[in-house]
């Protein structure tokens, strides 16, 4: 003879892959204390329990190890404990109370199990900014997992000196000291659930911070073509009356900040131009000399200086022979 | 007998309160999870709340959650429903009923009408 | 939400003829459940865990389906039968019952 309960609340319910969920179950408060027996979670349709608290019985390969009878008859508690579930899981349960000394059992109503895609992704956390040449501790975590799957595999991606650090359950540290070039690479970290078989992963790119390394200044030269300086130049000749565009640019993150000066300027020089650009429309005796590109950033700066030498035309000069 | 029989219901103007109790006999009360049903004049039936044995569950309608609240009474084999903010959509027959998958009971109802 | 929409909303039949009515879900559900309805009184249980019929209902009636897509049959209509039969899902929150179809007898 069969007595029948309720499991209560929604008759379904929803797991992502690799994750954990507790199917609820209530035993009846009808249940006499006297009642001796164990507890079975079947399959739908199956004889042989996906969990079961009595020692002598077999429970399925395929469930064995994930499904766990939560079983406390006194508080009444007959829930269903499953871990890294997989696809294969999606199906209909029921639990049933089974005594081999009293005549009559009791079963409950079904409860499906729905198995989605894992839809959660890793969260990469890094404490204020990448600082070139200065370690920093990013941490991929999976806040979402439960404590009682089987830990994933952590696995980190990136063309930056790393080192790995500490690691939980849900988390992993990876020690990173990024250098100016690993700016806007691509970091990843990869977690395996091997309990499901499913991975996930999240990229996302570096935003180094760095002094300039590089000033170069590009020379626009009435309509000639354009040519650059990369390193301190001592006499660039020009001719009297010419249009000269000097334009200044650095590499760093966040971008330094340009001004041009005449002469080999001081910490606290006034700048004749406040940006990379420096125009000048008529080149003459007074422009004759050193203009000086700096390229200004918190963590350090750059410049880069170029000699203006002013070719004369011949009927242009006065007091002339 | 009736297992479930609601009571409490009556002709209540709009933004009042009303109680609703469903008395349980015949069977062991503290073994089932009780939902409210309505269904109002001419429509179809329309869930409101549930609430499980041991009251450690309760789940309502978006229509009426933050207005209606359901509890019960073990030891009283009694459910209620306090209903507050009512609104002229409310009106309807009120039925407690246990939806079990082989026991399933509903109240003969009680008629709540919020009226001007 | 899951919403359950019923069709016909009402039909008429005459006795011995079947009679087929249908649920669909917005979204798939678990399990359909069917309740039966007379005018002036409570709904019953007709149908439980999609296919199951409620003790006490007649074997002429069957049910079937899955996902989103269920239906209710009366292989032979009789007289008793009409009544407004109402589909319900709790396969998530909020708990949803169909707008019912009404049976008719000719």
């Known amino acids: 003879q069969e007595r029948r309960f309720q499991l209560e609340g929604p008759e379904s319910l929803t797991v992502q892959e690799g994750l954990c969920v507790l199917v609820p179950c209530r035993l009846p408060t009808t249940l006499p204390a006297s009642y001796y027996g164990y507890g079975y979670w079947f399959l739908e349709g199956a004889d042989v329990p996906v969990a079961t608290n009595d020692p002598d019985e077999e429970v399925q390969e395929e469930t064995r190890g994930r499904f766990h009878l939560l079983w406390d008859p006194r508080r009444k508690n007959c829930s269903l404990s499953i871990r890294d579930a997989r696809r294969r899981d999606n199906a209909a349960y029921f639990f049933r109370l089974k005594s081999k000394w009293m005549k009559y059992g009791y079963t409950s109503s079904k409860l499906s199990v729905r198995v989605m895609a894992l839809t959660h992704r890793p969260n990469i956390s890094i404490p204020g900014t990448l600082e070139s040449g200065h370690p920093s501790n990013l941490t991929c975590s999976v806040p979402w997992v439960c404590e009682q799957g089987t830990p994933p595999i952590f696995s980190w991606m990136s063309a930056a000196p790393t080192s790995l650090g500490p690691r939980t359950t849900q988390s992993s540290v990876l020690t990173i000291t990024p250098r100016p070039q690993d700016h806007s690479t691509n970091l990843t970290c990869q977690v395996t659930f091997p309990g499901a078989g499913v991975t996930m992963e999240r990229t996302i790119q570096l935003n180094v911070s760095y002094a300039p390394q590089k000033v170069a200044i590009s020379i626009f030269q009435g309509n000639s073509a354009a040519f650059k300086i990369l390193q301190n130049t001592s006499s660039l000749p020009v001719l009297e009356g010419q249009a000269l565009r000097l334009l200044c640019d650095a590499d760093g993150n966040p971008p330094a900040h340009l001004s041009w000066f005449q002469g080999f300027p001081a910490l606290n020089a006034t700048p004749i131009s406040n940006t990379g650009v420096l125009e000048l429309p008529q080149v003459g005796s007074a422009e004759e000399g050193d203009f000086t590109c700096r390229a200004q950033h918190p963590l350090g700066s750059l410049q880069i200086s170029l000699s203006l030498f002013v070719h004369w035309k011949p009927e242009g000069r006065a007091g002339g022979v | 007998e009736v297992p479930l029989v609601e009571s409490g219901g009556g002709l209540v103007k709009p933004g009042g309160s009303l109680k609703l109790s469903c008395a349980a006999s015949g069977f062991t009360f503290s073994d089932y999870g009780i939902h409210w049903v309505r269904q109002a004049p001419e429509k179809g039936l329309e869930w409101v709340a549930y609430i499980t044995s041991v009251s450690s569950t309760i789940y309502y309608a978006d229509t009426v959650k933050g207005r209606f609240t359901i509890s019960r009474d073990n030891a009283k084999n009694t459910l209620f429903l306090q209903m507050t903010s009512l609104r002229s959509e409310d009106t309807a027959m009120y039925y407690c009923?246990?939806?079990?998958?082989?026991?399933?009971?509903w109240g003969t109802g009680t008629t709540v009408t919020v009226s001007s | 939400q899951i919403v359950l929409t019923q069709s016909p909303a009402i039909m008429s039949a005459s006795p011995g003829e079947k009679v087929t009515m249908t649920c669909s879900a917005n979204s798939s559900v678990s399990f359909m459940h069917w309740f039966q309805q007379k005018s002036g009184t409570s709904p019953k249980r007709w149908i439980y865990d999609t296919s199951k019929l409620a003790s006490g209902v007649p074997a002429r009636f069957s049910a079937s389906g899955s996902g989103t897509s269920y239906s209710l049959t009366i292989s032979s209509m009789e007289a008793e039968d009409a009544a407004t039969y109402y589909c319900q899902q709790w396969s998530s929150n909020p708990l949803t019952f169909g707008a019912g179809t009404k049976v008719e007898l000719k």
């Open positions: 009923a246990i939806l079990d998958w082989y026991f399933d009971v």
